[in-house]
């Protein structure tokens, strides 16, 4: 639509030219032509000209009824035919919207990603409004009640610099338009709660030449946290289903995970920690795909595993790839066997 | 020390206008801070009507049954922020006060000395 | 959020120690403020954060609480502590709903 109009007359519209969707709208148009007397005025929506619920109200001005508008965006203008003249004369044009007052934010998540400085929040913003939404996080100290508001769109990075004052804070959200307001739920923060350590990598993995093969996966992260709990997942690529394996790890050097696996198979690990006793976990990490040797000799595969010395394992579980995990985008990466010689799977960064 | 002096109280007809001031000193206007108002009839208790939030935007906040009516808004340049009346009633007449901590909390440790507004005919 | 204090009036002699509650209609941790009012001055901040003494405010009088319900006490009435006390939250004022943030008030005078 145009937004600046040279009008001669005026249009305007009952509710107002923002309104909810689904509403009837009245769109009236009133001329004010010099040397016009108009036999006719005429509207049109998105340029095209309308045919019905056109009321003349007076000789100067009429009115387009919709019932139940629905379209989200739609420039209306209104023209009068003149006597004596062979185009229509323009009065006035509008932009009009219609959409939704906005769902209170749900979902509110704040983590601090190690290393990076910011605390990152994130929500759900609901059904869509259609109109112009601007969401402003609130972040409020518990010690001092100093408060500090950031304008946002979908998510939200807060410089740690700023967060200086205290450790304990509320944090909302509050999402606003033309035709509402709604807060989220208050969100709880302490920040030396809601770090999630440094990316956890697979960096290579190798396949023993022993009686009985084992696939030790070696492993690594950046993160200064001492205590930090791991889980690992793999499954052969023609698998539906995950194990999982649980460690204790301390990073302060790579880590090192055995596994008694199916021969002559494909793996994909991926690994993802947390914390030791906070809530907020890192996303898995990329696929790293392995390729097991050749059987040697015949015997009935178990697929289990051990732990590396230095790790502390709790428990195996199965989990499907329909599980409460999150979903994963699944690049299943070549691996190669060069002589007979372990593989080392590629992975991803 | 903050200080905070209001002005524009008066007699007013009802359904007419009125805009308010509140002059501020000693707030650093380049930090955030709320600027609140709150009125108080006659023989009533305070009545909250609104804040506004300077920080890297401004936002406003309303009583809801101020919204509509009130109106907040605040000249920098000036170090003043206003309380806009429209359509004003007889139960509208009270003393109305600005009031802030000169930072970004919701509790009050400076008030101005009160205006009043009288709406009647 | 609605804060509900009570009493509305309270009578009591010098020396007495006084207590005025305030409630608020759901969770607001311990974001409130009590101030004292005398006729035809503006209020006075004596308490926020439910329990921190505003600066100059004689020791007399503390707060407490937190969540949805709030104390003001006055350990020994002077004189000067007869007026009004109002309690408000400090929480958040973004609700679309709110209606006051102020308690109704509590007007304390002299017995007798």
């Known amino acids: 639509g145009i937004t600046s109009i040279n009008c001669s007359g005026d249009m305007w519209v009952e509710p107002g030219e923002i309104f909810q969707m689904g509403m009837n709208v009245s769109i009236y148009c009133q001329e004010a032509l010099k040397h016009c007397r108009p036999r006719n005025l005429y509207f049109y929506k998105n340029g095209f000209k309308e045919e019905f619920d056109i009321t003349r109200i007076n000789r100067t001005t009429a009115r387009i009824w919709y019932k139940g508008f629905s379209e989200p965006h739609a420039y209306m203008h209104c023209t009068a035919e003149c006597p004596g003249h062979f185009q229509e004369t323009l009065i006035c044009g509008k932009d009009i919207s219609s959409g939704h007052p906005p769902d209170a934010p749900s979902n509110l998540t704040c983590v601090i990603y190690e290393y990076s400085g910011n605390m990152t929040c994130t929500w759900n913003t609901g059904k869509p409004t259609y109109i112009d939404t601007k969401y402003i996080v609130h972040v409020k100290s518990l010690e001092t009640e100093e408060e500090q508001q950031y304008l946002a769109s979908s998510y939200v990075k807060i410089s740690t610099d700023s967060l200086q004052g205290s450790r304990k804070y509320l944090v909302w959200v509050q999402a606003v338009n033309s035709l509402g307001m709604e807060n989220s739920q208050q969100l709880h923060v302490h920040l030396d709660d809601i770090v999630i350590p440094s990316a956890s990598i697979i960096s290579r993995a190798e396949t023993t030449n022993d009686t009985v093969p084992k696939t030790i996966v070696y492993w690594k992260s950046k993160t200064m946290i001492e205590k930090v709990f791991c889980e690992m997942r793999y499954k052969t690529t023609t698998n539906q289903t995950w194990s999982v394996k649980e460690f204790d790890a301390n990073f302060t050097y790579v880590q090192q995970s055995e596994f008694y696996l199916e021969p002559d198979s494909k793996y994909v690990f991926q690994v993802r920690c947390q914390e030791t006793g906070k809530r907020n976990w890192q996303p898995w990490s990329s696929p790293f795909v392995h390729q097991t040797s050749q059987e040697t000799g015949k015997r009935n595969w178990q697929p289990w595993s051990s732990p590396f010395v230095h790790q502390t394992s709790q428990t195996v579980s199965q989990v499907t790839a329909k599980s409460s995990h999150e979903p994963q985008k699944m690049e299943m990466l070549s691996a190669t066997i060069f002589r007979g010689h372990p593989a080392s799977g590629n992975h991803q960064d | 020390e903050v200080q905070l002096v209001e002005s524009g109280g008066g007699l007013v007809q009802p359904g007419g206008s009125l805009r308010l001031s509140c002059a501020a000193s000693g707030i650093d206007f380049n930090s955030n801070y709320y600027m609140c108002w709150v009125r108080q009839a006659p023989g009533k208790g305070l009545e909250w009507i609104g804040c506004?939030?300077?920080?890297?935007?401004?936002?406003?906040y309303y009583a809801n049954w101020a919204k509509g009516r009130f109106t907040i808004s605040r000249d920098n340049s000036k170090n003043t922020v206003y309380l806009q009346m429209n359509s004003l009633r007889a139960e509208d007449t009270a003393v109305y006060y600005c009031a802030t901590s000169g930072s970004s909390v919701l509790y009050f440790k400076f008030w101005g000395q009160g205006t009043l507004v009288t709406v009647s005919s | 959020i609605q804060m509900t204090q009570s009493p509305s009036s309270l009578s009591a002699s010098v020396g007495d120690r006084v207590t005025i509650t305030c409630q608020a209609s759901e969770n607001i941790y311990s974001f409130l403020a009590w101030y004292q009012q005398k006729p035809g001055k503006a209020p006075k901040l004596l308490i926020y954060?439910?329990?921190k003494l505003a600066a100059g405010v004689p020791s007399r009088f503390s707060g407490s609480g937190s969540g949805t319900d709030f104390t003001l006490t006055i350990s020994s009435l002077q004189p000067e502590d007869f007026a009004t006390y109002y309690c408000?939250?400090?929480?958040?004022?973004?609700?679309?709903?709110?209606?006051?943030?102020f308690g109704q008030g509590t007007k304390l005078t002299v017995l007798g």
């Open positions: 408000q939250q400090t929480n958040r004022y973004s609700n679309p709903d709110i209606y006051n943030v």
């Open positions: 506004i939030y300077v920080g890297s935007h401004v936002n406003t």
């Open positions: 954060s439910a329990s």
